[in-house]
């Protein structure tokens, strides 16, 4: 646990039992801000959550402490270590001076909290532009103007060939100075990120002579997702969706290359479907066949009625608030024309069920249905547009006979999930069920996908 974070057990000797944070309220951290203000959002950085809690129960309430004396409860929040929790506070409408973060997880670590004001807050009227200071090791000469005002370019003229230099940038606001930025190391006379030459030995994948993210070659000279860079200096182009299936994008670009099927496997898309909730606005049959390549997965969508139902099924007959209160379960069954031994199930999303009001990720429960109508549970899986399509591997219990799967059942609890396709991935030219049925004196022929008689040549 870092000295820069707060945790319920941070004050406790590591050799003693950490304090419990008993239900219903648990432990809480109270933070006060320098200036009371009408908030637009609250951001909290969490650096550790116990695995027992996952993301869902660690923060069981956040209270805003209003100047009026009112405590405004924001309720339970889902927290993650890789993304700060941001809560929009559009309807608070009164000055807040502090917060209380309640937790049932004695190991939870909180690094920072930031209250952002609404626009045109009187506190910001006196704000001055930020200044920047460049620091070097070895130090710059005293007479070098290392403080930058409105221009953001610093030229160092005092360099010796072959010498190693490290640079940091410090932000200055009024009389306050920030922590130094991460260092950049430069050997005078050798290449660097931004010189237009790709130094592979320094980990550069591209160099477009600038330090801008989002143009295909990142600030650290790394090639960005969905871009391809060629030549020196690098010229980068956005290849995903340009209609040309290039070799390097076969595994990643559904738009250009269709769904990637690894060698030795066969992907079968649903040939029929049945769903729990449908009407003329959201028919279940749209998930039959391969998903439309043009569909990009969208997150935090609350109105799915615009242009989704032609490409994907979602349970449009039930509103989001209703489904939450009624705890409705939605399901779809995808049927496949050729029952096979499943290697994986592939689920294509158009929306991942996330709701802008919280950070909870939706999960789906997946089952395989075999030709004897037996169900085989593949467990719960988290949905995310970052991980789309969702590929669920099928692990076979080798102490049990193999089975042919004829359908997949997917169930979930949010009407904000839209599914555009379901595939059954099986082994190409290899059927374990048939293989295991070969008699003595027979061998499995991949070409004929059946057992064939063989005789040993002596």
């Amino acid at each position: 646990s870092s000295v820069r974070t707060w945790s319920p057990n941070s004050a406790v000797n590591p050799h003693t039992v950490p304090p419990a944070c008993p239900e219903p309220q648990g432990c809480y951290l109270e933070l006060e801000f320098l200036y009371p203000l009408v908030p637009e959002s609250l951001t909290i950085w969490v650096t550790f959550v116990s695995t027992d809690w996952d993301s869902s129960g660690a923060v069981n309430d956040i209270k805003l402490l209003a100047v009026s004396g009112k405590n405004i409860s924001l309720g339970p929040q889902n927290v993650f270590c890789d993304v700060p929790l941001t809560i929009r506070l559009w309807d608070v409408g009164e000055e807040v001076y502090g917060i209380q973060i309640y937790t049932l997880d004695e190991h939870l670590e909180i690094d920072a909290a930031m209250l952002t004001s609404t626009a045109d807050t009187p506190l910001c009227l006196q704000c001055k532009p930020l200044k920047y200071k460049v620091v070097r090791d070895p130090p710059l000469q005293m007479d070098v103007a290392s403080i930058l005002h409105l221009n953001r370019k610093f030229v160092d003229m005092d360099l010796n060939l072959g010498s190693v230099y490290q640079y940091w940038v410090i932000t200055i606001s009024g009389t306050e100075e920030s922590e130094p930025s991460p260092a950049v190391t430069y050997i005078h006379g050798s290449g660097y990120c931004g010189d237009g030459i790709i130094q592979k030995d320094q980990g550069e994948q591209c160099d477009d002579m600038n330090k801008i993210n989002g143009d295909g070659c990142s600030l650290f000279c790394r090639q960005e997702v969905s871009f391809n860079c060629i030549d020196e200096p690098s010229r980068c182009y956005f290849h995903d969706g340009d209609g040309v299936c290039e070799e390097f994008e076969q595994k990643t670009s559904i738009k250009d290359c269709g769904v990637y099927t690894p060698q030795g496997f066969l992907d079968q898309w649903a040939s029929n479907a049945s769903v729990s909730h449908q009407d003329q606005q959201c028919p279940g049959w749209v998930i039959i066949g391969q998903p439309a390549a043009s569909q990009v997965c969208r997150t935090k969508v609350i109105d799915l009625s615009e242009g989704i139902s032609q490409h994907a099924w979602y349970p449009c007959t039930i509103s989001y608030p209703y489904s939450q209160l009624a705890q409705t379960t939605f399901w779809l069954r995808a049927y496949f024309s050729q029952p096979m031994v499943a290697a994986a199930v592939i689920v294509h999303l158009v929306t991942d069920g996330t709701y802008y009001g919280d950070q909870k990720q939706e999960t789906i429960s997946v089952q395989l249905l075999d030709t004897k109508d037996q169900s085989h549970d593949l467990g719960l899986h988290v949905l995310s547009c970052r991980n789309n399509p969702l590929i669920i591997p099928v692990v076979h219990d080798l102490s049990q006979p193999f089975y042919h799967s004829q359908a997949v059942r997917v169930s979930f609890s949010s009407p904000l999930v839209a599914i555009s396709g379901v595939a059954l991935r099986s082994f190409d030219n290899f059927d374990p069920v048939t293989l295991s049925s070969c008699q003595r004196g027979e061998t499995y022929s991949p070409a004929e996908q059946s057992c064939v008689h063989f005789a040993c040549e002596k």
Partner: antibody, heavy 123, light 107 residues
Framework: QVQLVQSGAEVKKPGASVKVSCKAS????????MHWVRQAPGQRLEWMGW????????KYARKFQGRVTITRDTSASTAYMELSSLRSEDTAVYYC????????????????WGQGTTVTVSS | DIQMTQSPSSVSASVGDRVTITCRAS??????LAWYQQKPGKAPKLLIY???SLQLGVPSRFSGSGSGTDFTLTISSLQPEDFATYYC?????????FGGGTKVEIK
């Protein structure tokens, strides 16, 4: 027929609490949701929250979070709405309204309304 | 919160007239819109749910249409008992919100 009968008018002092009841008849109480809505004089209707009368699950408008509590007594087929820390702005007519079926919704909206309970907050 | 804006805020009409009231949501609400009628001193009455479905017992002169953000309530031939205030309400997201109301008055 389906009917919702609410408790009588209340006069309260600022800082006090009020509890309004809503007795349902003519349908299976636990199969439906119950909304609470208020209307201040000359103002638009304002949704406060709702309860799944079967499970007791609730959801409140953030504006009232921490001040409002919606409960139900299934044996009496009655829903309750309690509002605490009353202030003069809470002077309004408070309505309960039956929401959709929690089992198989065929209709949405607030189908049936109580007659309303006038709550006056004054020092 | 989703803001619901009704227009006009009031309309003067005669018996037999066709009256149209519009309701605009600040963001898409799919089909989840209801219309209510309220008379002075009375509780509101549900007319239409899910944009266009007529509540049981409501006369067929009332109809609703729209999707996404723009919705309409139409009274095809105004009757004496229709003079009242009409509210739209979204139930696509929390908190459920109502429009400011449209008062239909006798010309």
């Amino acid at each position: 027929q389906v009917q919702l009968v609410q408790s009588g008018a209340e006069v309260k002092k600022p800082g006090a609490s009020v509890k309004v009841s809503c007795k349902a008849s003519g349908y299976t109480f636990t199969s439906y949701a119950m909304h609470w809505v208020r209307q201040a004089p000359g103002q638009r209707l304002e949704w406060m929250g709702w309860i799944n009368a079967g499970t007791g699950a609730t959801k409140y408008a953030r504006k009232f979070q921490g001040r409002v509590t919606i409960t139900r007594d299934t044996s009496a087929s009655t829903a309750y709405m309690e509002l605490s820390s009353l202030r003069s702005e809470d002077t309004a007519v408070y309505y309960c309204a039956r929401g959709p079926s929690m089992e198989t919704p065929t209709t949405y909206g607030m189908e049936v309304w109580g007659q309303g309970t006038t709550v006056t907050v004054s020092s | 919160d989703i803001q619901m804006t009704q227009s006009p805020s009031s309309v003067s009409a005669s018996v037999g007239d066709r009256v149209t009231i519009t309701c605009r949501a600040s963001q898409g609400i799919s089909r989840w819109l209801a219309w209510y009628q309220q008379k002075p001193g009375k509780a509101p009455k549900l007319l239409i749910y899910s944009t266009s479905s007529l509540q049981l017992g409501v006369p067929s002169r009332f109809s609703g249409s729209g999707s996404g953000t723009d919705f309409t309530l139409t009274i095809s031939s105004l009757q004496p008992e229709d003079f009242a205030t009409y509210y739209c309400q979204q139930e696509n997201d929390y908190p459920f919100t109502f429009g400011g109301g449209t008062k239909v008055e006798i010309k």
